[in-house]
């Protein structure tokens, strides 16, 4: 349309913006690698990262992995989005007992309530069969079909663990606060994953859980607490801090209860492959100090030589004349220099090679 | 927070060459080590080159003799030029200011620009 003609030259004429004439209207240019969430974006905010298929983008807006439902106790839930994760739970007939980001570490089979006992609350994928006794007058073979539910087909009575106490003796069948049995959190404790939090004797709809204080009933101001060198993660689960007892790292932040240990490399040392709160590869940090001239800045940097020289000798860290955009050139690597010396005086992981490479000496 | 802008990126076959700049007004650039990370799709954030302010320079083995860094301190810009690129050079590539006191964690893409997408297709 004529009456276009000048809008649309004016849009023309902003390198960030570009003309859309399905829509007639100025639009936002996304930056190189975004996307546009819409036909015709108006700002930064409608740009987005696109993902490969099977990964979304996260809250830091990284491509992170959906995690997968293909084991056979788990079924998908929620599929994987662009910006959110594929969840899974535990297939019909089962109950999570260790729960993980999106998905569940362990599934069990609903329980069976026992002879005397009837079924208070039927089983879900979150939670197992809560059992009740029976009232009085009621026989075991149930007066109400209701109260006699027979788990889905395919099920088999969760098997009962070693009582874990003499206190505990009769918690197979005793309910205990709210219905929820002792032996359930026995059992996921005796199959719980190693290293995870343990909630035996603590009863709690999250294993690993506990208020920081007792709570007035119908309180919700109880913050959940988990165990030591576990933290509260944003969907409110116990998640295990890193460790940074690696020899090449050192605790930048500390666990908190609801934030993870944050490691980094220790100093002369620069992250080369990143991991989440940590680095899963260090590497000695591979250019001279300007100012340290020829003498190295610690030993870490010592280590980091461009060509390996004779054991006990100091690296040449003269810097080369600069003129304006200073390039490149080819560089020796340092692979040599991290097997023969570095390793001698460097706790570096072996788990990963090294690759090291420097130049402009 | 300091930010810095990266540009250059695009899809590219397999062979063919980019070349990103990584720049800022926010501060003078000969001072500090500069430093290109990459992060493809799924994976952890991984280094790519450093070049100090007087110009020497270091690379991972993986691009070693096929990018090239370089800094022009008077215009504030961090170049790295990709020759020969390949398939699994496919990545979003970040800028980062002085890795040697700050990419000690693996924090060090998307902090402080939002990076440039290379994308290779063989």
């Known amino acids: 349309f004529p009456q276009d003609r000048p809008f649309e030259d004016t849009c023309r004429g902003n390198p960030g913006h570009y003309y859309d004439k399905a829509v007639r209207r100025c639009c936002y240019r996304c930056p190189t690698g975004l996307f546009p969430t819409q036909q015709c974006p108006q700002r930064p905010a409608d740009c987005r990262k696109q993902c490969e298929p099977d990964y979304y983008l996260d809250e830091a807006g990284r491509c992170t992995a959906c995690v997968s439902c293909s084991r056979d106790d788990l079924v998908e839930k929620m599929p994987c989005a662009w910006n959110s994760s594929r969840v899974c739970e535990c297939q019909p007939g089962m109950f999570c007992a260790v729960s993980v980001v999106n998905s569940c570490a362990r599934c069990f089979f609903h329980s069976v309530c026992p002879a005397g006992m009837i079924v208070k609350f039927p089983g879900t994928a979150q939670k197992n069969t809560v059992c009740e006794p029976a009232s009085p007058g009621v026989s075991p073979a149930c007066a109400s079909p209701e109260n006699c539910k027979e788990p889905s087909s395919g099920t088999i009575p969760q098997a009962k663990p070693t009582p874990v106490s003499p206190a505990t003796s009769n918690a197979s069948t005793m309910p205990l606060r709210g219905g929820t049995r002792l032996a359930q959190e026995a059992a996921s404790k005796l199959t719980r994953a190693p290293g995870s939090p343990s909630s035996v004797g603590r009863p709690s709809s999250d294993p690993g859980l506990s208020p920081t204080q007792p709570c007035p009933q119908g309180s919700g101001d109880c913050r959940k607490q988990c165990e030591p060198d576990y933290y509260l993660d944003e969907a409110g689960r116990c998640t295990a801090c890193v460790s940074c007892s690696r020899d090449d790292l050192v605790e930048k932040t500390p666990c908190a209860w609801n934030s993870s240990r944050i490691c980094e490399c220790r100093p002369g040392m620069i992250c080369a492959t990143s991991a989440t709160n940590s680095c899963a590869r260090c590497v000695p940090y591979p250019i001279c100090a300007a100012e340290t001239g020829t003498k190295p800045q610690d030993m870490a940097e010592k280590d980091t030589t461009f060509e390996a020289p004779p054991v006990g000798t100091q690296p040449d860290c003269s810097p080369t004349p600069e003129n304006g955009e200073a390039p490149a050139s080819t560089s020796p690597t340092l692979s040599s220099l991290v097997d023969s010396q570095a390793s001698k005086t460097l706790p570096i992981p072996t788990s990963a090679p090294i690759a090291l490479s420097s130049t402009g000496k | 927070q300091m930010q810095l802008v990266e540009s250059g990126g695009g899809s590219v076959q397999a062979g063919e060459t980019l070349r990103l700049s990584c720049t800022t007004s926010?501060?003078?650039?000969?001072?500090?080590?500069m430093a290109w990370y990459r992060q493809a799709p799924g994976n952890e954030c991984v280094l790519v080159s450093i070049?100090?302010?007087?110009?020497?320079?270091y690379y991972a083995d993986s691009v070693k003799g096929r990018f090239t860094i370089s800094r022009d301190n008077a215009k504030n810009t961090v170049f790295l030029n990709l020759n020969s690129l390949q398939p699994e050079d496919t990545a979003v590539y970040y800028c980062?200011?002085?890795?040697?006191?700050?990419?000690?964690?693996?924090?060090?893409?998307?902090?402080w620009g939002p990076g440039t997408q290379v994308t290779v297709s063989s």
């Open positions: 070049i100090s302010a007087d110009g020497r320079t």
């Open positions: 926010a501060f003078t650039f000969d001072g500090p080590d």
């Open positions: 980062a200011l002085d890795p040697r006191k700050n990419c000690r964690g693996g924090y060090c893409c998307a902090n």
